[in-house]
């Protein structure tokens, strides 16, 4: 069964900078990746970025840069302009669509006790959505 992993990392040099790493573990080619925060895409979450292997990427503040790391993983850099660092308590979700097989989505957040520069372990919590 395909799985999606999500890592949220606070940058050691800039405490206001976060990076979300997501990857797809499974067969098939990825047709679209959606990164959202505040919940799953389409279920109260707000799109932060959409990455298409051919059409390119779109991103919205506070997302700074979305890019492909491999054919099945992406990273999204976020810039936290606020002083209270709301990202620390935010859930980030990544949905990988593999057309026409369906889509798989997992969510993760920065562990409460994380030191800067440490990332959350990849704990897949797959949400199977056959679109």
């Amino acid at each position: 069964t395909p799985e999606v992993w999500v890592q949220v990392q606070m940058e050691a040099t800039e405490l206001s900078s976060f990076t979300v790493h997501c990857g797809f573990l499974g067969p098939g080619s990825i047709s679209l990746v959606t990164v959202s925060w505040g919940g799953p895409d389409g279920a109260g979450g707000t799109k932060l970025a959409v990455l298409h292997p051919e059409l390119g990427t779109r991103q919205w503040a506070p997302a700074r840069q979305a890019r492909w790391e491999t054919q099945s993983s992406i990273s999204l850099a976020l810039e936290d302009s606020g002083a209270s660092s709301p990202f620390a308590n935010t859930t980030f979700c990544c949905k990988f669509a593999s057309f026409p097989e369906g889509s798989w989505e997992s969510c993760g957040s920065l562990p409460p006790s994380s030191d800067p520069g440490l990332s959350a372990p990849p704990t897949p919590v797959p949400i199977l959505r056959a679109d």
Partner: nanobody
Framework: EVQLVESGGGLVQPGGSLRLSCVAS??????????MAWFRQAPGKGLEAVAG???????TYADSVKGRFTISRDNAKNSLYLQMNSLRAEDTAVYYC???????????????????WGQGTMVTVSS
């Protein structure tokens, strides 16, 4: 709950221009649909797809409006626009904004998979 609100309709003479707008909003979160589109329904007729645009800017048009209408969107403002030039009497209709997601981020064949709809704005082309 997602809401689509259209504006910009009105009465215009043949050959004139109008610009329709549509804003997508949601309670509790920001809704950014992959696909947004315009449809229209002329008096006594069925629903007709006019134009669609995906989140990457790819567009598609009905043959009847190609070269006259231009669809565009502002992703940051969650807004959709339809610039209508060289209007004809047969363009008279209620124009609806629609939005939805798709498996690959593009607009599906117009009329499919768009699960949110506005209330419509009336466009009348008459001298």
């Amino acid at each position: 709950e997602v809401q689509l609100v259209e504006s910009g309709g009105g009465l215009v003479q043949p050959g004139g221009s109008l610009r329709l707008s549509c804003v997508a909003s949601a309670s509790g979160f920001t809704y950014r649909p992959y696909c947004m589109a315009w449809f229209r329904q002329a008096p006594g007729k069925g629903l007709e797809a006019v134009a669609g645009i995906d989140i990457f800017g790819g567009t598609t048009y009905a043959d009847s409006v190609k070269g006259r209408f231009t669809i565009s969107r502002d992703n940051a403002k969650n807004s959709l626009y339809l610039q209508m030039n060289s209007l004809r009497a047969e363009d008279t209709a209620v124009y609806y904004c629609a939005a939805g997601d798709s498996p690959d981020g593009r607009c599906p064949p117009l009329g499919q998979g768009l699960n949110y709809w506005g209330q419509g704005t009336m466009v009348t082309v008459s001298s």
